[in-house]
Every structure is written in C-alpha cells, then in structure tokens.
C-alpha cells in the first residue's frame, strides 16, 4: 500500500503522537488544522523525536513536502544559531536537533519563511514560502499517558480498530493516547468497545480488562464470567451474578452495588438503584437526601426520661436532679439511697472496663458543668464556662458518629480535629467520658480515643485531618486544591481563632482525591505533607478570616489572596544547545518578585538538577506558556463550610442542678 495514500496516519509513544496528514495546505492552514485537533505542528527537537518522525514519514517521494512547526519572520536571520532565527510554533527556539538541507547562507532574509520536511531520503528541512500549499503536514499531540495496544485474542474477528482523540482511525498503533477508543469485533458476533481512561490508582489504562471475546460456551474459563455462566440457545454465553450482586458494565464481572453506594450508614443490595440505604437506630434518613442519616432527637419523645434528658448524636441520656439516683433501667429516678443505685453503679462498672480510676472520672465529670457540643472540624469555640481540664472525650464512638467534647480552654492549642475513633467495642452503650488533665495524661484504652496533649504527638491515620473540600471557580472539580497543610501557634490568644494557612503545596495529581498520608510533628507545629500535583495547577494561599463570629462557629470563611506561586516542576534534563532561552512551564504564570510574599519562596524546595541550564524548564519539552485569554475580576472568595453540629436539646437544668447521676443511652437499647 502506498504510504502516501490519502489517509492520515500516526505513530504514538507513551506521551506523544506524531500524525501525518497528506493534505495540501499552506503553513497557516496546517497550523490551524493541528490546533483544531488539539495539537500543534510537529516540533522534532531531539534525535529520538526525529527518529519517530522518520519512521512515520517513511520513504516517501522526493516531490512530497510536509510542514513542521518552524517559522521565521522577515529580517530575523540568526545564522549562527541552530534554528537560524526560526522559532517553533510553541514559541521558543530550544532544540537539540536540526536537519537543515543546506548550510546557512548569508542572505538578507527579506521575507517570512517556514520549514517543510522532505518526505524522501533523510527527511531534510527546507525553508520556503509559508503561503505555498505543500503536500501535507505533521502534527504533534502531547498527552498525560497512553494505553498499550490490545493483544489479539483467539476469538477476535480481526485486529482492534483504534480511534484517537485527534480523529485518526487505524489498526496500526503501539500506544493509544488517553481518550482513545478501541473497537474489537469478535467472531461470535458481539464486539467490545474500550476507552483509554484515567485509572483510580493513577496512570491510564483500558476501561475493561480482557478477555474481550468470550469463547464458545461456558466450558473454557467459565465463559469469562465471574459468577454464573449461562449458555444461550444461539451458542453465545451470558453472565449472571449471585443474589446481592449486579452485572458490571463489562458484562462479565459482578459488583456489589453497596461497595459504590453513597450510603452514610447502612446499605442493602436491591431496589431501583441496585441498593437502598438504611439508618441505624437513633438515626433517620435525611429529608433532603435519603443517603444521609440525621440524628433522632429522642428527648422530644414524651416520657423518654423520667426527669431530665440530653440528646446526643445517635443516642440520649437521662439525668436525675440532686437527691435522686438513676435506676437500673436508665430512665427512672428514685430518691438517693434507694435500691436502684447499686444496680446503676454496677452497670457503669461493667461498661467502663478500662482500668481507669473511676473516682477521678466522677470528680471531673461533676466538676464540669459547661455544655457539650459537637466539634466538626478545626474550630475554636468560645466556652460557656471554661473547664478545669484540658480535653475530654467520650470513649468508644461508633465510626460514623462525630464525638462531642467539652469546650477546651482557649489558651490551649487546638486539637487538629475531633478524631474519628474506630468502633472497637461490642458494648452497645456509650459510657461516661474519660477526662484527662494536662498534668496527668492517661493512656487511651481500647475503648477510648486518644487525647491530644499540648505537645501534639503525631496523629494516627484514623485521627488525621478530614479533607475540607473547596469550590474553586477557575478549576474543574478534579483539580480543586484542598487545604494542604495546617499550622498553628502553640498558644493562640483567647477568644481568637488561629490562622490557618496553606503552605506551598506539592500539588495533587489530576483526578486524585487529596489525602493526608503523612503527618509529621515538630514541637507544637503540625504540618500535613501531601503527594504532588502536576505543576499546571497553581496553589492558593489562603488565610483564615481574623475573627470568627461567636454566634456562627461552624463557618470557616477563607479568603484567597490569589497569590500565584512560581512553580519549579520536577525537572527534566534540559536540552543543551546554544539557542537556549528560558521557557516558562506550560500553563503557569510566574509572579514578579515584587508581588510575592517575602516568606513564601523560602518554602520552595529546589528540585532542579545541578546540570540544568535554564532556571525554569518546561514540563513537557515542547511546552511554552500559551497566551490564554484571562478574565480579570476580583480575587475569588473561597468559602469553606464545615458541617454545623446537629441541634441538641440543651440541658438547661444542668446549670442549676448538679449532675448527681446520669446515664448515657444508645438508641439501640430502645
């Protein structure tokens, strides 16, 4: 077959494709054609790239010429430079390769010139009139990753037909760029269509794993089915799943609908969506979203406690007034000294099996007559009455419940978050809080969450800062920055929230949720270190508003200072030529030194190798900051809303009456 047939063709590697379009076009038309497909005219800057171009072009006729991405304006001759004054269409003159047909001649360069590549022989570079419609053009497409060509299977009717994002259709690919589609026809009649997609674990891969063409019947490899294989009358096989599972999109594997279901608490297979959500006792489905569960306020139920009731998330507590004791049923109250008191104390002992000094706990419990409240995130709240101890937690919260803690003293360093404690205990109730003072720290037991003392020991994974999602208007959701590290001073002033600032982040990889895998502690400063983000997403420097209104402690409003930090990407070896000029990284804007906060650049670790000749090298060797239209406007406000604590029935009576006896009830007792 004539390689110069009318059909375009391409050669792809793991990170870029070259495509040959045998269409007669002027330079400008060719440039536009490449841009419309999401690429650029080819810029073969290295011998390796030139080799790929050579293999794509092949041994064409000498009469054929192909545009590449080099042009020179009139009177811009620089004959001593490798590119002779020509500039790549990406805007720079960096190259480690040239292939000029003739040595430079000392002409005056009176007119604009563009470069075409000879289709024959050594594919030499020729300069000529940009308005000449040559025989074709070479485009180049860069991408984040590629999928390897599919292996042929026994049951295939022919080779896979690939369609690239730049609309090339061929069976002759070694690599397929992200976004390509593979169509496989099977001998059995049915076909499969696969997409080269981003994988959850990173990288790219085909949307389906092989085998794509099932054998005849169920006998070989269960027909490719994960669960049950059924042989149809026409000889085809179909797959079925056992109860509680549903057939996945690939038609062969089975998936648990609850594995992906967004149920907050409990999930059961079945129903119109393939699953249905349920709430545990003490909770009910939220009216606006049946996937979520909200606390049931049992204290609103008449007669739930004989005397006083305090609701908390997932349960409630009954209390008795001074001179009364809670009976064994946890509801009734009897005058002090009556028979029920011992039973109640026994129950407390049984539930509190943790080796702590119970007298101390009782004393601390009684001493505290401030209110309980939920602490949903990194917040300071003004205490109604400061306790005489540092932090107190209720032990053994089931994992989906937010613990409630007494208001901490404002002079204490704040906890990073109210930790989510894994649910270890088989005991159904929630017992009295373990109170730990700063002078006498107590080791947590299996039923108690760890207490964060003043020296901030490193948090375990279960207790790390929850990710705070932020809507950043200029970025797609996959690229929204999270709050990347939090630092606070050891002693924030009383009644003032600490500053929360994001240090310079190593930005998240696209399409990956930000996680907090590595929290390190130095003194009283805690910094959470995060995995890296590609350098085409500038970080936000955020500062917390100076004062949070006491009446709205659940709202964190972050202002973005819109300070774009210069990014030094993970360096690639620079191309060493005499024609070097600094190139900005793709899609990045460096901030002039004058506008940068003085302290910020010191946070940037230098990642450049010692042999780097340019201060900033491009992320992709062919990239230059394009002139992207900018919509100027005010700096975007970034509001982070933390979930409000569920309204609790405030124990107003507790202020006047001491808590002589109390009980904590889990609604599963009801």
């Amino acid at each position: 077959q004539d390689p110069w047939a009318a059909e375009p063709r391409a050669a792809c590697g793991p990170s870029s494709c070259y495509a040959l379009f045998p269409r007669r076009r002027t330079f400008l038309e060719a440039w536009r054609a490449c841009r419309e497909l999401g690429g650029d005219l080819a810029t073969p800057r290295t011998p390796e790239e030139a080799q790929r171009v050579d293999s794509l072009v092949g041994a064409g006729p000498a009469s054929r010429l192909l545009w590449i991405g080099l042009q020179r304006q009139a009177r811009q001759c620089q004959l001593q430079r490798p590119l002779r004054g020509f500039t790549w269409t990406t805007g720079d003159q960096d190259t480690a390769f040239t292939n000029w047909a003739q040595p430079a001649s000392g002409g005056p360069c009176p007119a604009q010139r563009c470069v075409a590549l000879e289709a024959s022989g050594e594919h030499r570079w020729l300069e000529g009139s940009c308005t000449l419609a040559v025989d074709g053009y070479l485009c180049q497409f860069g991408f984040e990753g590629a999928c390897p060509a599919l292996q042929d299977e026994a049951g295939q009717a022919g080779p896979a037909v690939y369609t690239t994002p730049f609309h090339l259709v061929s069976t002759e690919f070694e690599w397929l760029p992200f976004g390509s589609v593979a169509a496989v026809q099977c001998q059995a009649g049915r076909g499969a269509s696969l997409l080269c997609v981003k994988q959850p674990e990173g990288g790219v891969g085909w949307s389906r794993a092989g085998p794509l063409c099932l054998g005849t019947g169920c006998s070989p490899d269960n027909g490719g089915c994960e669960h049950e294989c059924v042989e149809e009358v026409d000889g085809h096989v179909s797959c079925r799943c056992t109860e509680g599972f549903r057939l996945a999109a690939d038609g062969r594997s089975c998936e648990d609908p609850c594995a992906q279901a967004p149920c907050e608490q409990q999930c059961e297979p079945g129903g119109p969506q393939g699953y249905s959500c349920h709430c545990r006792l003490g909770f009910r489905p939220a009216e606006d979203d049946p996937h979520r569960c909200v606390d049931t306020d049992e204290c609103q139920i008449a007669g739930v406690c004989q005397q006083m009731c305090v609701n908390y998330v997932g349960g409630f507590e009954c209390y008795c007034s001074e001179g009364h004791e809670l009976e064994a049923d946890g509801i009734s109250c009897s005058p002090a000294g009556a028979m029920g008191a011992q039973a109640s104390q026994d129950l407390g002992d049984e539930l509190l099996d943790d080796g702590e000094d119970e007298e101390d706990e009782d004393e601390a419990w009684k001493a505290f007559n401030g209110g309980w409240t939920e602490m949903p995130g990194i917040l300071w709240m003004e205490p109604t009455q400061p306790p005489d101890f540092a932090l107190a937690y209720r032990p053994s919260f089931p994992e989906d419940r937010e613990p409630q803690i007494p208001y901490p003293e404002p002079t204490w360093p704040p906890p990073l978050s109210a930790p989510r404690v894994p649910y270890h205990s088989s005991v159904l109730s929630v017992t009295r809080p373990v109170v730990v003072s700063a002078t006498h720290p107590t080791l947590p037991s299996a039923h108690q969450p760890p207490v964060i003392p003043a020296t901030h020991p490193a948090l375990s994974r279960d207790h790390q800062i929850p990710v705070i999602a932020a809507n950043y208007p200029d970025l797609p959701s996959a690229y929204q920055p999270g709050i990347l590290s939090v630092s606070h001073s050891a002693q924030p002033p009383a009644h003032q929230p600490p500053m929360i600032s994001t240090k310079y982040p190593e930005l998240f990889p696209a399409h990956q949720s930000p996680m907090f895998p590595d929290t390190r502690v130095a003194g009283t400063q805690t910094t959470t270190h995060l995995p890296g983000i590609p350098p085409n997403h500038a970080p936000l420097v955020t500062t917390l508003g100076a004062q949070l209104p006491p009446q709205a402690p659940d709202a964190l409003v972050l202002r973005t200072q819109a300070t774009q930090l210069p990014i030094i990407p993970t360096a690639q070896p620079s191309l060493t030529t005499t024609s070097r000029s600094p190139v900005s990284p793709a899609h990045q804007i460096s901030v002039p030194a004058a506008t940068q906060p003085a302290a910020l650049p010191t946070l940037l670790p230098s990642q450049s190798p010692t042999n780097q000749t340019s201060p900033i090298s491009p992320t992709h060797p062919h990239s230059k900051a394009p002139q992207i239209p900018r919509e100027d406007g005010p700096s975007p406000k970034l509001a982070l809303w933390l979930p409000s604590p569920a309204p609790t029935a405030a124990p107003t009576a507790l202020g006047e009456a001491g808590l002589a006896e109390h009980s904590q009830r889990d609604d599963r007792w009801l």
């Epitope: 009469s63 010429l65 007119a111 010139r113 075409a116 000879e118 000529g128 009139s129 000449l132 419609a133």
Partner: antibody, heavy 124, light 108 residues
C-alpha cells in the same frame, strides 16, 4: 543532465483529440511532478494540470472541464497529455515542465526544466 | 483565481541600462513567485524562485524582491542576450499556477 523531450507538432481537426508525450531523462522520473502549460499565439502562459509520477496523482485546471487527461508510463519515464474536443482556440504550443522540489536548501514549486514544446494547430 | 498584472507590457532599453519590471498580485501570495525569461521559439527558463532567490546558473545581474502582492525583477546592467519576454508566475494556491501577461523587453 536533465532533459524533457516532447513529441513533434500536430495538426488536428476541430472536435478531434490530440495526445502528446514528454520523455524525461537525467533524473529519477518518479521524484518530480510534471506540469503541462500551454501558450496560445500572443497570449500568456496557461497552466493545464499536473501529474505526480510517484502515485499518478493528478490535478487539472477547471477551465478545461474534463477535456484534458494526463498520464505517465513510469517504465518509459514518459508523461502524456491528451486534449479532447479540440477547437481553434486550442491552437497553441504545449509545454511539459518539471516542478522543482528544492534549490540550495529552499523548497519551491516553480518549474525548473521545460520541454521544447509541441505545437498543436487546430484547423478545419 | 489570483490574477497577476505585469507592468510595463513593453519596454525599450539599451545595453548597460538598469531595468525594473513589476508584477502585482490580486491577493497576498507571500513569496511564492517566480520569474521566467522566454526567447522567441524557446521554452521559458527559470530565473528567480521564491520571489528573491536566484536559480542556479543565472547571472548575478538578475535579482528579485517583494512579498505579498508587489514583486519586482531587476536587471542591474542590461546585456544583449537579455532582450526577451519576462513572465512572473505565482504558485501560492498550488497547483493553480497563474502567469502574468508578460513584459517584452526590446532593444532601444
């Protein structure tokens, strides 16, 4: 040296067809496009069409409305041009010309070598 | 179609004279312009390609300039063998070549 040698003069009747030849030598025939250009007495040069001997790719001037056909015989390194439905307006000298590919590091589509021309006279 | 207009159509000059012939294009053709010399009974010969590049073997007294729509052929010192007809040609909308009507240069 490069040479394009054309066939001899033709006298044709109106309505007839004429086919002339252009034999190339001194270069690789399939590496260069061949154009046909005519020049009527006292008129400017007029491009008629071309053929790429490498793949027989052809393009014609719309003015000739399908009356012209250009072919090649690669084995003989010869290009042919046939013009049908002749009228007196077609009386002219017909040239074959080779399109240059590059000169001294420049690509260019000017015509660097020409045949001596074939005079076609259309007369009743 | 792109039209090429040469001026003058006829001109007389003497040996040693400096001669300039102009070619105007009806639209921008960049530098895709060539100049040919044709003597009676002969085929055209290429003098200048890409508006300003002298073809191999062409004497240095011939030069070309211009880009866009205006082009000139200059003979710096006319020789007796230079009396001929000169044609400009554009090939920017290749393969639709068009030629100017020609400038006949005669001995004064």
């Amino acid at each position: 040296q490069v040479q394009l040698v054309q066939s001899g003069p033709e006298v044709m009747k109106p309505g007839a067809s004429v086919k002339m030849s252009c034999k190339a030598s001194g270069y690789t025939f399939t590496d260069y496009v061949i154009h046909w250009v005519r020049q009527a007495p006292g008129k400017r040069l007029e491009w008629m069409g071309y053929i790429n001997p490498y793949d027989d790719d052809t393009t014609y001037n719309q003015k000739f409305k399908g009356r012209v056909t250009i072919t090649v015989d690669k084995s003989a390194s010869t290009a042919y041009m046939e013009l049908n439905s002749l009228t007196s307006e077609d009386t002219a000298v017909y040239y074959c010309a080779r399109r240059g590919n590059s000169y001294d590091g420049y690509f260019d589509y000017s015509m660097d070598y020409w045949g001596q021309g074939t005079l076609v006279t259309v007369s009743s | 179609d792109i039209q090429l207009t040469q001026s003058p159509s006829f001109m007389s000059a003497s040996v040693g004279d400096r001669v300039t012939i102009t070619c105007r294009a009806s639209q921008n053709v960049g530098t895709a312009v060539a100049w040919y010399q044709q003597k009676p009974g002969q085929a055209p010969k290429l003098l200048i390609y890409s508006a300003s590049n002298r073809y191999t073997g062409v004497p240095s007294r011939f030069s070309g300039s211009g880009s866009g729509t205006e082009f000139t052929l200059t003979i710096s010192s006319l020789q007796s063998e230079d009396f001929a007809t000169y044609y400009c040609q554009q090939y920017t909308n290749y393969p639709m070549y068009t030629f100017g009507q020609g400038t006949k240069l005669e001995i004064k």
